[in-house]
Amino acid sequence: EEELQVIQPEKSVSVAAGDSATLNCTVSSLIPVGPIQWFRGAGPGRELIYNLKEGHFPRVTPVSDPTKRNNMDFSIRISNITPADAGTYYCVKFRKGSPDVELKSGAGTELSVRAKPSAPVVSGPAVRATAEHTVSFTCESHGFSPRDITLKWFKNGNELSDVQTNVDPAGKSVSYSIRSTARVVLTRRDVHSQVICEVAHVTLQGDPLRGTANLSEAIRVPPFLEVTQQSMRADNQVNVTCQVTKFYPQRLQLTWLENGNVSRTEMASALPENKDGTYNWTSWLLVNVSAHRDDVKLTCQVEHDGQPAVNKSFSVKVSAHPKEQGSNTAAENTGTNERNIY
């Protein structure tokens, strides 16, 4: 009699993650009597995928009714495929006995799973940095197959070149992950800047996946300070102004000191934004000159975003001959430099 054949017609089958895979298997004869089982892998470590007689295989269903008389089609359908299902599947005929004895195996069908990369997640530095400093952004995407993938970084539409990218694992795997780090040099104009991580893969329908991060989360723009005397009023009151300009973020506390003693403390809030995303703030202090015998040293002290305080001082001259109304006097800089980078 003709020897029984177990026919697996496809050497390989490729499916998209989430879809169903059909693994075909037919036998050439009904004799000898005995069950068919499906395994993933060969040898002693093989994994049972489907056995009609026993076991619970919720994702595996027979393509045709295996209980019908003279059935020779033992194809199966595996639903909701994941990359972990990749491997070579064997349809194996057993001879009925106690126990059943393996008689013949099909040639095997390799199941290849294509899976889309996850949406790229971009993370920035834990602490803010100032202009001219370099900060690192990281982009991660997971779960894709095959391994080939391209990742590009852009800042405001321009591709970045200071990039290091790794795809893991290096060897064969059911799915892969990509991690990339881009180094970006900050400028004072970067409050409104954005970095984009763009991932392209064969499974994506022509459109790369993008992850973004705003440089506003990573940058600190320290303020410029200027103290000026606006005018000497007829009632011997001097209006002194502290202009705090071009700073980001908005978190800022301003303290006025008169001869070293705290006069007033203010917190910045609800400030209008400049075109470049930075903020300006102006604080006024009225000084009653007639209440002082000596010159008054006024200090505008600014604490920005938890950084060490920056001071700008100004001496109001107490004189028998007050200055004409409307005159403007710039501050003497007895504090730190006007432009502070910390």
Epitope: T150, V202, G206
Partner: antibody, heavy 116, light 109 residues
Framework: VQLVESGGRLVQPGTPLTLSCTVS????????MGWFRQAPGKGLEYIGI?????SPYYASWVNGRFTISKTSTTMDLKMNSLRSEDTATYFC?????????????WGPGTLVTVSS | DIQMTQSPSSLSASVGDRVTITCRAS??????LAWYQQKPGKAPKLLIY???FLYSGVPSRFSGSGSGTDFTLTISSLQPEDFATYYC???????????FGQGTKVEIK
């Protein structure tokens, strides 16, 4: 699932022409679509694709001469200033469900003849 | 751009013959290679994708192999309906561009 090209005809050199590919049985917003051409007695040549979101990409030789666009059910190929060497059958095709590396559904083609 | 070199450009064979067509890429395309069959006046038909995967409905006498730069299409036993022109097509995952081989015409001996 079906693709049908239209708009091919005899035109004079220097004339513009727009070809259309009408699809049925699937949504253009889910697949990459491509344009190809084949000069008489020659091989297949890739022109360009349009992504599922509508971004076009072109073969390097196109150099701005052709423009690919789409609506909900049609994909267009706008050809400027046609030359005699553009005489060919133009095919539209859809990529496979597993990825953009192959085209599994093709239209029958439409013939464009450029001659004075 | 990647160049695809297909050989032979034509071949004569008889029904029942085993036919092999090769395609070589100018640089690695991993397994991103498809094979198409085209008959005169008709659109191309997909046979093989990802170098070795048989497209649905294509007879099992067609098979593909190879990866990197060298690929093969094999027809194990040529049938009368197989006389046609065959094209390989690559996709490069970095440039995201497509290139076709120049074609192989399979004729009746």
């Amino acid at each position: 699932v079906q693709l049908v090209e239209s708009g091919g005809r005899l035109v004079q050199p220097g004339t513009p022409l727009t070809l259309s590919c009408t699809v049925s049985g699937f949504s253009l917003s889910s697949y990459v679509m491509g344009w190809f051409r084949q000069a008489p007695g020659k091989g297949l040549e890739y022109i360009g694709i349009i992504s599922s979101s509508g971004s076009p990409y072109y073969a390097s030789w196109v150099n701005g001469r052709f423009t690919i666009s789409k609506t909900s059910t049609t994909m267009d190929l706008k050809m400027n200033s046609l030359r005699s060497e553009d005489t060919a059958t133009y095919f539209c095709a859809r990529v496979g469900p597993l990825g953009v590396d192959y085209f599994n559904i093709w239209g029958p083609g439409t013939l464009v003849t450029v001659s004075s | 751009d990647i160049q695809m070199t297909q050989s032979p450009s034509s071949l004569s064979a008889s029904v029942g013959d085993r036919v092999t067509i090769t395609c070589r890429a100018s640089q690695s395309i991993n397994s991103y290679l498809a094979w198409y069959q085209q008959k005169p006046g008709k659109a191309p038909k997909l046979l093989i994708y990802s170098a070795s995967f048989l497209y649905s409905g294509v007879p099992s006498r067609f098979s593909g192999s190879g990866s990197g730069t060298d690929f093969t299409l094999t027809i194990s036993s040529l049938q009368p309906e197989d006389f046609a022109t065959y094209y390989c097509q690559s996709w490069h995952y970095i440039s995201r561009s497509y290139t076709f081989g120049q074609g192989t015409k399979v004729e009746i001996k």
